[in-house]
Interface confidence: low
C-alpha cells in the first residue's frame, strides 16, 4: 500500500520522496531493502538521503531496486517503500511507455501541461519543452513556471511532451527529463444539419472535352468531434462505386477545422479525359450526418475553347 514506483534515466538526477508522509520535524531513515544497509546522508555520496527525499545525483542503472524509508516520531514509526528503476537512455526518439508519466488532457480553453515531479527538484526557469523530441518553437508555446501553455490548442497538438530542466545541488548541475502524453479533448461541440459550402445549388461547371476536371463537394457539420458525417458524390442518383465508370473517381479530401471551429469535410470528384457523354450526367454532392442529408446538384457544360478569359 505504501509503495511508490519511481523511475529515471541513467546520468540524470532522480529524487524520490518517501511514500509515508510526516511532519518536517520527524526523522526519516533510508535503507537498501535487500541488504538493510543504511543510506548515508552525507551529500558527497552519489546516492544520499535528505530527510523525506532520496537523491541519486546522478542515477545509475545499478541503483534500480527497492528502498525502505522509515518515518520516525516520538510515538510511532511508519514504513514506506520506493521501487526505483533506472533505465538506459534511448538512442531513438521514441519514449517507451514505462518512462511515461500520467497522461493529461487539454482543450481549447485549458491547455496546461505540468512538468511531472519537478517540485522535488531545485531548479530555475526556464524549462525546456519538446514534443516528440522536437524543441517547441513559436508564439503558441509558452513555458510558464513549471508548466507549458499551448495557445489555440488543436487535435494535432496531441502527443508526447518532454520537459527538461537542471537540478542544482551544492553548485553542481544535473539534467532531468520527464515525459507525459497530452491528449486533446473537444470543448462541448454540437452537430448541425449539414451545410454545403461548395458547389452552389444547380451550379454549372464549365469543362473542356478531353481534359481532366475536378469537382469539390465541401460541407460543414457542426463544432467539435463529429462521429458520423460524410460527403460523397452521386452520378444520376447512383454511388460512384456502383456507376462503373473508371474515369470518374471520388477521393476524400482533408478534414478541415476552420478558425470558427466548424468541422468540415471535402470530397473531390475527379473526371479524367472528359467526354461528351459526361455533360449529360447529373452530379450530386451529398452531405449527410445524424440530422439528415443535403444535396446540391451540378451539371457540366462545354467550355468555350476560344474564351480562356472566363
Amino acid at each position: 500500500k505504501f509503495s511508490k514506483q519511481s523511475w529515471g534515466l541513467e546520468n540524470e538526477a532522480l529524487i524520490v520522496r518517501c511514500p509515508r508522509q510526516g511532519k518536517p520535524s520527524y526523522t526519516v531513515d533510508w535503507y537498501y531493502s535487500q541488504t538493510n544497509k543504511s543510506i548515508p546522508t552525507q551529500e558527497r555520496n552519489r546516492v544520499f538521503a535528505s530527510g523525506q527525499l532520496l537523491k541519486f545525483l546522478p542515477a545509475a542503472v545499478a541503483d534500480s531496486g527497492i528502498y525502505t524509508c522509515i518515518v520516525r516520531s516520538p510515538t510511532f514509526n511508519r514504513t514506506g517503500y520506493a521501487n526505483v528503476t533506472i533505465y538506459k537512455k534511448q538512442s531513438d526518439c521514441n519514449v517507451p511507455d514505462y518512462l511515461m508519466y500520467s497522461t493529461v488532457s487539454g482543450s481549447e480553453k485549458n491547455s496546461k501541461i505540468y512538468c511531472p515531479t519537478i517540485d522535488l527538484y531545485n531548479w530555475t526557469a526556464p524549462l525546456e519543452w519538446f514534443k516528440n523530441c522536437q524543441a517547441l518553437q513559436g508564439s503558441r508555446y509558452r513555458a510558464h513556471k513549471s508548466f507549458l501553455v499551448i495557445d489555440n490548442v488543436m487535435t494535432e497538438d496531441a502527443g508526447d511532451y518532454t520537459c527538461k530542466f537542471i537540478h542544482n545541488e551544492n553548485g553542481a548541475n544535473y539534467s532531468v527529463t520527464a515525459t507525459r502524453s497530452f491528449t486533446v479533448k473537444d470543448e462541448q461541440g454540437f452537430s448541425l444539419f449539414p451545410v454545403i459550402g461548395a458547389p452552389a445549388q444547380n451550379e454549372i461547371k464549365e469543362v473542356e472535352i478531353g481534359k481532366n476536371a475536378n469537382l469539390t463537394c465541401s460541407a460543414c457539420f457542426g463544432k467539435g468531434t463529429q462521429f458520423l458525417a460524410a460527403v460523397l458524390w452521386q452520378l444520376n442518383g447512383t454511388k460512384i462505386t456502383d456507376f462503373g465508370e473508371p474515369r470518374i473517381q471520388q477521393e476524400e479530401g482533408q478534414n478541415q477545422s476552420f478558425s470558427n471551429g466548424l468541422a468540415c469535410l471535402d470530397m473531390v470528384l475527379r473526371i479524367a479525359d472528359v467526354k461528351e457523354e459526361d455533360l449529360l450526367l447529373q452530379y450530386d454532392c451529398l452531405a449527410l450526418n445524424l440530422h439528415g442529408l443535403r444535396r446540391h446538384t451540378v451539371r457540366l457544360s462545354r467550355k468555350n475553347p476560344i474564351d480562356h478569359h472566363s
Epitope: Q226, A230, E252
Partner: antibody, heavy 118, light 107 residues
Framework: EVQLLESGGGLVQPGGSLRLSCAAS????????MSWVRQAPGKGLEWVSA????????YYADSVKGRFTISRDNSKNTLYLQMNSLRAEDTAVYYC???????????WGQGTTVTVSS | DIQMTQSPSSLSASVGDRVTITCRAS??????LNWYQQKPGKAPKLLIY???SLRSGVPSRFSGSGSGTDFTLTISSLQPEDFATYYC?????????FGQGTKVEIK
C-alpha cells in the same frame, strides 16, 4: 466477397502491448469509416474506437483513451489497433467492423482473441 | 453517454412463435437504432438499420419499428436458425453504445 480479417491477438501480461490488424477486401476501404468493437467473455458488445476514411479523425471509448491507438494504411487496405498498457479488463474478442453511412456496423470480421493475464 | 436497455435479457420460444424484443434509449435517438444477431463463437451480423430498414439478404420475418427512445425488433415466425443473441445499438451520438443483449433460446 466483401470481408474483414483480423489478426494479432494473443496472450499478453498486464502492462504489455499488442497490435491488432484487420485486412479488408472487396470494398472501397479508403472511403470507409472503420471501427473496433470488443466483447469480453460472456459479456455484450463494447465499441472501442473509430477512424475516418482518410485517417484524419480518430475516436476512442473513455475506457481505452490514452492507451489504444487506431490507425490505417489505405495503400494496404489494413486497419490497426495498437494496444498499450493492457489490463485484465481488456481481455476480449476484438472485432473490426465497417461503419455504414447510417452508423450501423454493416460488415464484421471474425474476431481475434486478446487475453491479458499474468 | 447514451444508455441502451434491452428487455427481456433472455426468452424461451418455440419454432413458429412471434417474438418481440424491446430496446429503450436513455434519451431520444431519432431513428438511429440498429439491430444485430450473434450466434455463439461468431461475429455479430447486422439485421436492421435506421430502426426499420431491413439489411439486404436478411429474411423478411425480421422487422424493426420505433423512434425517439423506444424500439422493437420483431421476428414474425421464429425459425431454428434464429436462436441467438440479439443486440440493439444507437448511432445517434459518440460513443456508439449497445444494449446488453437478449438471448433467444429454444423452449
Amino acid at each position: 466477397e466483401v470481408q474483414l480479417l483480423e489478426s494479432g491477438g494473443g496472450l499478453v501480461q498486464p502492462g504489455g502491448s499488442l497490435r491488432l490488424s484487420c485486412a479488408a477486401s472487396d470494398f472501397n476501404f479508403k472511403n470507409a469509416w472503420m471501427s473496433w468493437v470488443r466483447q469480453a467473455p460472456g459479456k455484450g458488445l463494447e465499441w472501442v474506437s473509430a477512424i475516418s476514411g482518410n485517417g484524419a479523425g480518430t475516436y476512442y471509448a473513455d475506457s481505452v483513451k490514452g492507451r489504444f491507438t487506431i490507425s490505417r494504411d489505405n495503400s494496404k487496405n489494413t486497419l490497426y489497433l495498437q494496444m498499450n498498457s493492457l489490463r485484465a479488463e481488456d481481455t476480449a474478442v476484438y472485432y473490426c467492423a465497417r461503419v455504414g453511412e447510417t452508423g450501423a456496423f454493416d460488415i464484421w470480421g471474425q474476431g481475434t482473441t486478446v487475453t491479458v493475464s499474468s | 453517454d447514451i444508455q441502451m436497455t434491452q428487455s427481456p435479457s433472455s426468452l424461451s420460444a418455440s419454432v413458429g412463435d412471434r417474438v418481440t424484443i424491446t430496446c429503450r434509449a436513455s434519451q431520444s435517438i431519432s431513428s438511429y437504432l440498429n439491430w444485430y444477431q450473434q450466434k455463439p463463437g461468431k461475429a455479430p451480423k447486422l439485421l436492421i438499420y435506421d430502426a426499420s430498414s431491413l439489411r439486404s439478404g436478411v429474411p423478411s420475418r425480421f422487422s424493426g419499428s420505433g423512434s425517439g427512445t423506444d424500439f422493437t425488433l420483431t421476428i414474425s415466425s421464429l425459425q431454428p436458425e434464429d436462436f441467438a443473441t440479439y443486440y440493439c445499438q444507437q448511432s445517434y451520438s459518440t460513443p456508439p453504445t449497445f444494449g446488453q443483449g437478449t438471448k433467444v433460446e429454444i423452449k
